[in-house]
């Protein structure tokens, strides 16, 4: 058995009061699928900024606009949602400031009411002119997959016309949808050839047809509704930290893991060590040595400071972090230099995250 | 969707042993503690320990960590709790849950002689 | 340990009435609480986490509140389904304590 156990008993363990942490929900951006976003970093004296998505950097690309202080997200989808971070890189430090965005088709449960021109989707026709039904506004008809979060309201739109006038009817997953076929049942307001589900929860998932005819034809149109699960989720890591450092012998280092999480986050501080000259025990598990963990008797456990540093503090430093719901990790390397070598700037190179996924 | 089947109800003899499993579906199994959850006739829950599939590591309640013991299987997606030395105070429901959120639906465990 | 200590331990009720159950914590466990339900010989069903938050699928009649060492549950009308056992839960620090429970009982 390894003389150093990364956890012996303390995974799950923390005890440090959470003012270190942003546990708090941050600010959430709402986009629909299709829209554009923009959001402003709201940090002041940023030299640079650098921007995470779910604790992974994010860079330009096709649909992801980055200037200056601005992130834009262009034809927005629902795989854009998620935890949002920039950080303002300073000379003397860093600070990070979190959002969500939630691209979403959710409506809240009063908007069911507010459709302006719903009247004008139900169109009255010249009785001598007959004729199969059609879609009057296929615009509120091409988003065709709705990702809505758990408990939100959903309402699904079919505006028709048609001489006579159509019936709507609607089928989940190919079959009559019934009332008793969800908690809570569903409403159909006819005028403006809708469905509204309230409070939706994962069973609601699935196709959803409407069917509109009359004696002259029928059409339909199906949507997708997938609801997202809303749940406390394992502690996301600032990337890039802690970034890898080196100093002289001697010299002191310090590195530094920002923690995300919405329960109560325990840190660890791991080094890989060496006993009779060996990194691994007969099990083949690697000796590990805890330099320290958030609790009662420690300080900012997010930082870790190594003072009048050996040859021998040289290696990789692993920040691992759990909640009771999960763990991350990531490491940075220390070089340790002689004395007569000065050391680089390589504290602003960051280590390319270890996540455990 | 999120699923945790555990296996079926059992009936020992007190000094015997007993393992009681878990297997999960619906989401990616290294990535959340699974948890085991105690809960005795008439009584109410009291936490066992944890797992946490990606490393194995574990955190016991002092209470069960000398007889209680919690294992893996990643190749599975299968948890493990076995509980040895047993006594008649051990008779309970088990349950094991991925992070409290989602939950097994319980193993009786009988301890009689 | 954190000691959790639930009151009333059982109350009765009527439909539609508003119904609230208190948890009190031995020391300090900031947002740290979970609240859950149980009916008999099914597993309990998490309500609410981190003191405040909905789970999924669970409806908005029930809200939590609280923080540090006091909180509470709130089913603010009481539906016929809602009658079962409550339990909060310390997810601060291992072992990880729940209260002893609340039993909602039709009057």
């Known amino acids: 058995r390894p003389s150093f156990s990364l956890v012996e008993d303390t995974t799950l363990e923390p005890e440090e009061p959470p003012t270190k942490y942003q546990i708090s929900q941050p600010e959430v951006y709402v986009a629909a699928p299709g829209e554009s976003l923009e959001v402003r970093c709201l940090l002041k004296d940023a030299a640079v900024i650098s921007w995470t998505k779910d604790g992974v950097h994010l860079g330009p690309n096709n649909r992801t606009v980055l200037i200056g202080e601005y992130l834009q997200i262009k034809g927005a989808t629902p795989r854009d949602s998620g935890l949002y971070a920039c950080t303002a890189s300073r000379t003397v430090d860093s600070e990070t400031w979190y959002f969500m965005v939630n691209v979403t088709d959710a409506i809240s449960s009063g908007d069911d009411e507010d459709d302006t021109d719903g009247a004008e989707d139900f169109v009255s026709e010249n009785s001598n002119n007959k004729r199969a039904p059609y879609w009057t506004n296929t615009e509120k008809m091409e988003k065709r997959l709705h990702a809505v979060p758990a408990a939100n309201t959903v309402k699904f739109r079919c505006p028709a016309g048609g001489n006579p006038m159509p019936t709507m009817r609607w089928l989940k997953n190919g079959k009559e949808f019934k009332q008793e076929h969800r908690i809570g049942g569903y409403k159909v307001r006819n005028q403006h050839w809708s469905l509204i589900m309230e409070s939706v929860v994962p069973s609601d998932k699935g196709n959803y047809t409407c069917v509109v005819e009359n004696e002259y034809g029928s059409i339909n149109h199906t949507y997708h509704l997938d609801v997202v699960e809303r749940s406390p989720h394992r502690p996301i890591l600032q990337a890039g930290l802690p970034a890898n450092a080196s100093t002289v012998v001697g010299g002191d280092v310090e590195f530094v893991c920002k923690v995300y999480s919405d329960a109560q986050p325990h840190i660890q501080w791991i080094k890989h060590v060496e006993k009779n000259g060996s990194k691994y025990g007969p099990d083949g598990l690697p000796y590990l040595k805890v330099l320290k963990h958030s609790g009662i008797n420690s300080s900012n456990a997010e930082v870790l400071a190594l003072f009048n540093v050996t040859e021998a503090d040289a290696g990789e430093y692993i920040c691992k972090v759990s909640n009771y719901i999960g763990q991350a990790n990531q490491s940075a390397w220390l070089t340790v230099l002689p004395k007569q070598q000065a050391p680089g700037r390589e504290k602003e190179i960051t280590a390319s995250p270890d996540y455990l996924e | 969707q999120v699923q945790l089947v555990q296996s079926g109800a059992e009936v020992k003899k007190p000094g015997a042993s007993v393992k009681v499993s878990c297997k999960a579906s619906?989401?990616?199994?290294?990535?959340?503690?699974i948890h085991w959850v105690k809960q005795a006739p008439g009584q109410g829950l009291e936490w066992m320990g944890a797992i946490y599939p990606d490393n194995g590591d574990t955190s016991y309640n002092q209470r069960f960590k000398v007889r209680a013991t919690l294992t893996a299987d990643t190749s599975t997606s299968t948890v493990y709790m076995e509980l040895s030395s047993l006594r008649s105070e051990d008779t309970a429901v088990y349950y094991c849950?991925?992070?409290?959120?989602?939950w097994g639906q319980g193993t009786t465990v009988t301890v009689s002689s | 340990d954190i000691q959790m200590t639930q009151s009333p331990s059982s109350l009765s009720a009527s439909v539609g009435d508003r119904v609230t159950i208190t948890c009190r914590a031995s020391e300090n466990i900031y947002g740290a609480l979970n609240w859950y339900q149980q009916k008999p010989g099914k597993a309990p069903k998490l309500l609410i986490y981190?003191?405040?938050n909905l789970a999924d699928g669970v409806p908005s009649r029930f809200s939590g509140s609280g923080s540090g060492t006091d909180f509470t549950l709130t089913i603010s009308s009481l539906q016929p389904e809602d009658f079962a056992t409550y339990y909060c839960?310390?997810?601060?620090?291992?072992?990880?304590?729940f209260g002893g429970g609340t039993k909602v009982e039709i009057k």
């Open positions: 849950a991925r992070a409290f959120t989602y």
């Open positions: 839960q310390n997810v601060l620090s291992t072992p990880y304590t």
């Open positions: 619906g989401y990616i199994f290294r990535n959340y503690y």
């Open positions: 981190g003191a405040t």
